[in-house]
């Protein structure tokens, strides 16, 4: 699509995965395309097949190694190419010089659990997954709580401006069902974005004791 708009967006999970999305106006759904990754200072290269995710959008994951292995550093540059089959040949559609630590999106936090719950408050903890040791403590979190009768979009965002893998939710209503989600973002990187939201953790506050409010 010479005059159409295309977009090639990739993110590094900080360990061993680069996830890419390629979209192009007017492209055929059954077009066969791939992403090729060529690092400037590594012996390996990697390819993934772009699979359709919507009408004119394809996605794939470049698996660089074992999930917790540190495959790239801040000095690496990976040349990413989108190649699509046209008849008998592969045609280069897009090229990006990819700086992994400028384009970070971590995995969603995992292992959410209720540490302690009362009538009006709940303490919740979580863990980060496949996050590079390079970050040390340079991470931030956002959390949100789903109250009855509301949507996730309506939930106010709670910001934790440091690497704090727990939160104490307060001013909750007794004997009420809630859901909780958290996401993480490194402070590093011009194009870095928030991780996906964690799987929701459902919890229920304790009922108020008869005759008194705890």
């Amino acid at each position: 699509a010479v005059n159409g708009t295309s977009q090639f967006t990739c993110f590094y999970n900080s360990r061993a995965n680069i996830s890419c999305v390629w979209s192009q106006d007017g492209a055929l759904q059954d077009t066969s395309c791939q992403v090729h990754a060529w690092p400037d200072r590594r012996r390996w290269n990697q390819t993934c097949e772009l699979l359709p995710v919507s009408q004119a959008s394809w996605a794939c994951n470049l698996i660089l190694g074992a999930p917790d292995s540190q495959k790239l550093t801040t000095v690496d540059i990976v040349t990413l190419r989108v190649l699509c089959r046209e008849g008998v040949r592969w045609r280069v559609m897009a090229i990006q010089d990819f700086k992994p630590f400028e384009n970070l999106r971590l995995m969603a936090p995992i292992s959410l659990q209720v540490v302690h719950v009362e009538t009006h408050r709940c303490n919740i903890s979580w863990e980060i997954s496949q996050a590079s040791h390079y970050f040390e403590r340079h991470l931030e979190f956002e959390a949100r709580t789903l109250s009855p009768g509301h949507t996730w979009e309506e939930a106010p965002l709670l910001t934790l401006k440091q690497k704090q893998e727990w939160i104490c939710l307060e001013t909750l209503t007794p004997d009420t069902q809630y859901e909780f989600q958290v996401r993480v973002k490194p402070l590093q990187g011009e194009f870095t974005t928030w991780s996906p939201w964690s799987q929701p953790l459902a919890f229920r506050t304790k009922p108020a004791a008869l005759g008194k409010d705890t």
Epitope: V2, G4, A94, D97
Partner: nanobody, 123 residues
């Protein structure tokens, strides 16, 4: 904001050569990949070639592959288009353009544009 200024256009005989320059200034220009496009009278603007800054990876239109060479000089913040074996159908206004991250053949993928330099190839 990124500013792009093309130069090097002119009149040349068929079979001859010409080198166009695209000088850039502005915010962190060395992060932006650059493409060349051209527009002949009465025709749509078309992709010619593009290059990434860091790896120097290149992309060419089929019509110029093997005849044109795109290159860059990072120290001078300049991209060049060496045009050889020129044909009358290469006559056009040549534009350079900067993309944010990715080079493609689509003009809508480029965010910053120069004013153009005229190339005329006589038979």
């Amino acid at each position: 904001e990124v500013q792009l200024v093309e130069s090097g256009g002119g009149l040349v005989q068929a079979g001859g050569s010409l080198t166009l320059s695209c000088a850039a200034s502005g915010r962190a220009f060395s992060n932006y990949p650059v493409g060349w496009f051209r527009q002949a009278p009465g025709k749509e603007r078309e992709f010619v070639a593009a290059i990434t800054w860091l790896s120097g990876s290149t992309l060419y239109a089929d019509s110029v592959e093997g005849r044109f060479t795109i290159s860059r000089d990072n120290a001078k913040n300049t991209v060049y288009l060496l045009m050889s074996s020129l044909k009358p159908e290469d006559t056009a206004l040549y534009f350079c353009a900067a993309a944010l991250k990715t080079i493609t053949r689509g003009q809508n993928d480029y965010s910053y544009w120069g004013q153009g330099t005229q190339v005329t190839v006589s038979s």
